[in-house]
Interface confidence: low
């Protein structure tokens, strides 16, 4: 399926729209808000009861080339005594983002949008108990 | 820009960096992943730092619907089911890339936009703010 033509029922296509070949779209990859500096609550990944580590994945044919992924450090959660409590579960929280993928076919280059699932951090949950019959 | 390895047999005119503007196929790869977090997991209810999910809709953006997490409590839920204020529920935030219609209302012309979303919440030991 194609990208949903969001709001086409009420959008009047302006005359100023650039001409685009069929089956494709024009994408400016100069990022809006590129320079916003954001830092979450200090050391959130190590202060959490479901702590996590970060790893950076690098792919030169992807834009952005760097994607940071989190991995939960424990199966259980850290209790007030600093010990792992396996009656609770550390689970990953994930979020989709878009990337641009560059594909080489011989000497020609094409670009493809791709959805990537990023693990952002972890949270501590009460486990779902599956009773075995 | 990003430097990429080049096929040595190709002409030198190929740019090693991503160009500023590209023509992109309208089909999105991996686009059928579940985008409604309420359906994809119930972590938001089972977490010791539970959160509510708020629908953020913008027809000038793709995806047009993004779910924002808001922590339900300042503290965390303890083993007795009560809120423990010795711990803090804090949102986990992530910068994501979306498409913004540019110029506005154009069906097939977009610009990448970086936005900050709260994805869920986690329970942390607080940083104590000492009052002078």
């Amino acid at each position: 399926r194609k990208i949903p033509k969001v709001g086409h029922t009420f959008f009047q296509k302006p005359e100023s729209c650039p001409p685009v070949p069929g089956g494709s779209m024009k994408l400016d990859i100069g990022i809006i808000n590129e320079n916003q500096r954001v830092s979450m609550s200090r050391n959130i990944e190590s202060r959490s009861t479901s702590p996590w580590n970060y790893t950076v994945t690098w792919d030169p044919n992807r834009y952005p080339s760097e994607v940071v992924q989190a991995q939960c450090r424990n199966l259980g959660c850290i209790n007030a005594q600093g010990k792992e409590d396996i009656s609770m579960n550390s689970v990953p929280i994930q979020q989709e983002t878009l990337v641009v993928r560059r594909k080489h076919q011989g000497c020609s280059v094409s670009f493809q949008l791709e959805k990537v699932l990023v693990t952002v951090g972890c949270t501590c949950v009460t486990p779902v108990i599956h009773h075995v019959q | 820009g990003i430097t990429i390895p080049r096929n040595p047999g190709c002409p030198n005119s190929e740019d090693k960096n991503f160009p500023r503007t590209v023509m992109v196929n309208l089909n999105i790869h991996n686009r059928n992943t579940n985008t409604n977090p309420k359906r994809s997991s119930d972590y938001y209810n089972r977490s010791t730092s539970p959160w509510n999910l708020h629908r953020n809709e913008d027809p000038e953006r793709y995806p047009s619907v993004i779910w924002e997490a808001k922590c339900r409590h300042l503290g965390c839920i303890n083993a007795d089911g009560n809120v423990d204020y010795h711990m803090n529920s804090v949102p986990i935030q992530q910068e994501i890339l979306v498409l913004r219609r540019e110029p506005p209302h154009c069906p097939n012309s977009f610009r990448l936009e970086k936005i900050l979303v709260s994805v869920g919440c986690t329970c942390v030991t607080p940083i104590v703010h000492h009052v002078a």
């Epitope: 830092s39 609550s41 200090r42 | 300042l74 804090v90 935030q93």
Partner: nanobody, 124 residues
Framework: EVQLVESGGGLVQPGGSQRLSCAAS????????MGWYRQAPGKQRELVAL???????DYADSVKGRFTISRDNSKNTVYLQMNSLRAEDTAVYYC??????????????????WGQGTLVTVSS
């Protein structure tokens, strides 16, 4: 740093009304949640009401229909209008907020902050 300063506490008759205010100051960028908690003598601190950045509010069952929380985003202030007060509403009322702020050039989001508390006594 961020400070929360409450005002409006005091002695009020049963059935009467009182309005509490809490102002957040500091280099604040955004306030995700502001609200009120209370602690009666010998009891645990409990939620009274919270108001989220989108304007939606949550209330404790014990105050629904009697208390109204509101906020003035331009002043970084939250209010608690308390009507039909009862003796069991006597407590120290604490303002609480989850705030994003700048400090030393870094943006910090969502640290929980508490005010010093203001005493509300409902008695004849």
């Amino acid at each position: 740093e961020v400070q929360l300063v409450e005002s409006g506490g005091g002695l009020v008759q049963p059935g009467g009304s009182q309005r509490l205010s809490c102002a957040a100051s500091g280099t604040i960028v955004n306030i995700h949640v502001m609200g009120w908690y209370r602690q009666a003598p010998g009891k645990q601190r409990e939620l009274v009401a919270l108001i989220f950045s989108g304007g939606s509010a949550d209330y404790a069952d014990s105050v629904k229909g009697r208390f109204t929380i509101s906020r003035d985003n331009s002043k970084n202030t939250v209010y608690l209008q308390m009507n039909s007060l009862r003796a069991e509403d006597t407590a120290v009322y604490y303002c609480a907020a989850e705030i994003g702020y700048y400090s030393g050039g870094t943006y910090y989001s969502s640290e929980a902050h508490w005010g010093q508390g203001t005493l509300v006594t409902v008695s004849s």
